[in-house]
């Protein structure tokens, strides 16, 4: 059974994951982002089901394409580069989903834009956090 300290750690990791996903989304949605139209042409795979931490496997598998799309921003001055954000998200995802069991991700038939994709995983984090508090 999960202890209160392990639940607290999971909650904190989910909150950090949520914050960085929201940060990426905010940067993309910035009305001054000239690359937004191009970014929206890229399609992402969505999970058929995302209700448990093991389903983060589906997010992990899409992190490389996400980084590639974020690289389109090509800002002269990054406080944080796309690879910094994706690297941190990857570390959190690996810790949250665990590596003991191998879960085969099932994807929905319909693909999604980067905005829809990020919103889906933001909702996932919020949903799991709500069950822990």
């Amino acid at each position: 059974a999960p202890t209160s300290s392990s639940t607290k750690k999971t909650q904190l990791q989910l909150e950090h994951l949520l914050l960085d996903l929201q940060m990426i989304l905010n940067g993309i949605n910035n009305y001054k982002n000239p690359k937004l139209t191009r970014m929206l042409t890229f399609k992402f795979y969505m999970p058929k089901k995302a209700t448990e931490l093991k389903h983060l496997q589906c997010l992990e598998e899409e992190l490389k394409p996400l980084e590639e799309v974020l690289n389109l921003a090509q800002s002269k001055n990054f406080h944080l580069r796309p690879r910094d954000l994706i690297s941190n998200i990857n570390v959190i995802v690996l810790e949250l989903k665990g590596s003991e069991t191998t879960f085969m991700c099932e994807y929905a038939d319909e693909t999604a834009t980067i905005v829809e994709f990020l919103n889906r995983w933001i909702t996932f984090c919020q949903s799991i956090i709500s069950t822990l508090t």
Epitope: N77, N88, I89
Partner: nanobody, 119 residues
Framework: EVQLVESGGGLVQPGGSLRLSCAAS????????MGWYRQAPGKQRELVAA???????NYADSVKGRFTISRDNAKNTVYLQMNSLKPEDTAVYYC?????????????WGQGTQVTVSS
């Protein structure tokens, strides 16, 4: 409007350590990047290190392995632990608060704190 108050600068010998702190107040959003930039005399301002509220970090190559950035989200405070300081680290260090991972005109900057590394 965001206010940034820096502290911890000073004079230190080569090989020594310093810890900078920067507290943000005002219109703070939970999703942000805080960090440190520096400007040496006659040079352009450059990134030292930055950290997101989610824990993503970025370091300048010149400080990797020597400097560590951390933050306390509850206190809206960012810290820069500087070890093995070198004379070339001498500069004015500016705290930065941004709402996005890339630089834009809505970023906020502190007044700066002087760090001098000299024997």
């Amino acid at each position: 409007e965001v206010q940034l108050v820096e502290s911890g600068g000073g004079l230190v010998q080569p090989g020594g350590s310093l810890r900078l702190s920067c507290a943000a107040s005002g219109s703070i959003f939970s999703i942000n990047v805080m960090g440190w930039y520096r400007q040496a005399p006659g040079k352009q301002r450059e990134l030292v290190a930055a950290i997101s509220s989610g824990g993503s970090t970025n370091y300048a190559d010149s400080v990797k392995g020597r400097f560590t950035i951390s933050r306390d989200n509850a206190k809206n405070t960012v810290y820069l632990q500087m070890n093995s300081l070198k004379p070339e680290d001498t500069a004015v260090y500016y705290c930065m608060y941004a709402s996005s991972w890339y630089e834009d005109e809505t970023d906020y900057w502190g007044q700066g704190t002087q760090v001098t590394v000299s024997s």
